[in-house]
């Protein structure tokens, strides 16, 4: 008699999934090799050990701390780079601009990242069906919950000028429900951080209007001043121009705005 | 049983380029880092660069940045380094190479080599 | 970049002996060093790997030790069979870089 599964709204765990969290690992510190400290096994485990055998509607932040700690990384706080609803460009950026880093930069970003993942209570298996969707099911699902703590250590971890690429395609370019403004935003530390710098990434090829200027962006503005936090905006109207001067910087096309 | 296969010898002449591809079997190619080593003859061996196939990243060592792109295609599960502005110091047996799971960071695998003869 | 320094680059034994090659490191890379043998056209096979550890289905006969900076490879007793080039390699920071090589060859 097959046993009685609970169907979630969301799309299951990634197939491949423990096999793709520790070859990822593996790969990640072949890459870095200032994370070679780090036992992938272990990792695996204390990832498997946050959501194995417990409701994937009662995720919480304590259950990934082990995962955190094997985690734990350094990356200069002055040089990071947050996002919101534009990864690719985001990713190649810092791939070109080698000294920045994203979170899917850093182990537990990259270890994570377009991964889906759930289990189910009482039971070691893992939920290749179904996973519960964030709006449909539950917030506190293995994945939510995995990204809202790792993007709020980041935050915290950052200091100085902190970056933020912005998409201006967006009806919302800055979405208070979004990772960035619901949790990133918030946890950035005024005591640390001076400046918060939008970078306001344009879509369409004519599109030469200040984006800056957008209602969702003086909304963010707002928000960073109140918390004691110097706000500060750039249109970024040709992202293609941009890339490729962030690559040849000394192109004599590159003076002119991008 | 993991495979790397590489293409085959090239001859080409100064200020050419020459895309080299190394196919993989036998374990999931988004699963490893690729790496490229160069061989000149009589010479010893010179790590050149790698990419992560899953993400497309890549690292080229200084001396043949500008020069060595290398790519991956995961539809094909193939990677590739492409050298351009051959020069004759250029000609050498580049190999792709890559890390296993029980031997450290060492390249327990290895793709046979292609020969690249630059000559005018 | 890190300099490895490999010696001898060419040495003649006979068979039966006790081969030894070293390496030196520019700068500390803990155990992070690798050996490998290569026979002319064939493509490099790794003997060692994190200094000491031999690689699966190596003879017993090949060894290698050190840590920091200071690396050794041993062959125990030279057979016919290992006449071929041997490298080390640094795998601690990018760029990996290897040594210059040592020819061995039987006398």
């Known amino acids: 008699v097959p046993r009685w599964r609970q169907q979630w709204s969301g799309p299951g765990t990634t197939k491949r999934f423990p096999e793709t969290v520790l070859a990822r690992c593996v790969k990640y510190t072949e890459i870095h090799p200032e994370m070679r400290h780090v036992d992938c096994q272990s990792v695996w485990d204390a990832f498997k050990g946050a959501f194995i055998s417990k409701h994937p509607c009662n995720i919480t932040e304590e259950d990934y701390q082990p995962l955190m700690k094997l985690g734990t990384q350094t990356v200069p706080c002055n040089k990071i780079l947050l996002w919101s609803r534009i990864k690719d460009l985001a990713h190649q950026f810092t791939q070109v601009q080698r000294d920045m880093f994203t979170l899917e930069d850093t182990l537990l970003g990259y270890l994570a990242d377009d991964l889906t993942w759930c289990g189910e209570f009482n039971t070691s298996k893992i939920n290749y069906q179904s996973c519960p969707d964030w709006r449909k099911d539950c917030s506190n699902n293995p994945v939510s919950v995995f990204w809202k703590t790792v993007s709020r250590r980041f935050a915290e971890a950052a200091c100085d000028v902190v970056h933020v690429m912005l998409n201006g395609s967006r009806s919302k370019i800055f979405d208070k429900n979004s990772t960035f403004g619901s949790v990133e935003v918030h946890n950035l530390q005024p005591e640390k951080v001076q400046t918060l710098e939008a970078w306001v990434i344009h879509g369409g090829r004519e599109d030469s209007r200040d984006l800056c200027q957008d209602p969702t962006i003086k909304e963010l503005e707002s928000i960073i001043s109140k918390r004691n936090i110097q706000f500060s905006c750039k249109n970024i109207y040709r992202p293609d121009k941009f890339l490729q001067c962030v690559k040849n910087p000394e192109d004599s096309s590159c003076t002119s705005e991008i | 049983e993991v495979q790397l296969v590489q293409s085959g010898a090239e001859v080409k002449k100064p200020g050419a380029t020459v895309k080299i591809s190394c196919k993989v079997s036998?374990?999931?190619?988004?699963?490893?880092?690729m790496n490229w080593v160069q061989q000149a003859p009589g010479k010893g061996l010179e790590w050149m660069g790698w990419i992560d196939p899953e993400y497309g990243r890549t690292d080229v060592a200084e001396k043949f940045q500008g020069r060595v792109t290398i790519t991956a295609d995961t539809s094909t599960d193939t990677a590739y380094m492409e050298l351009s502005s051959l020069r004759s110091e250029d000609t050498a047996v580049y190999y792709c190479a890559r890390t296993g799971y029980n031997s450290g960071y060492g390249f327990p695998y290895w793709g046979q080599g292609t020969t690249v003869t630059v000559s005018s | 970049d890190i300099q490895m320094t490999q010696s001898p680059s060419s040495l003649s034994a006979s068979v039966g002996d006790r081969v030894t090659i070293t390496c030196k490191a520019s700068q500390n890379v803990d155990s992070d060093v690798d050996w490998y043998q290569q026979k002319p056209g064939k493509a490099p096979k790794l003997l060692i790997y994190?200094?000491?550890n031999r690689y699966t289905g190596v003879p017993s006969r090949f060894s290698g030790s050190g840590s920091g900076t200071d690396f050794t490879f041993t062959i125990s007793s030279l057979q016919p069979e290992d006449i071929a080039t041997y490298y080390c390699?640094?795998?601690?920071?990018?760029?990996?870089?290897f040594g210059g090589g040592t020819k061995v060859e039987i006398k």
């Open positions: 036998g374990y999931t190619f988004t699963d490893s880092v």
């Open positions: 390699m640094q795998s601690n920071t990018h760029p990996r870089t």
């Open positions: 994190k200094a000491s």
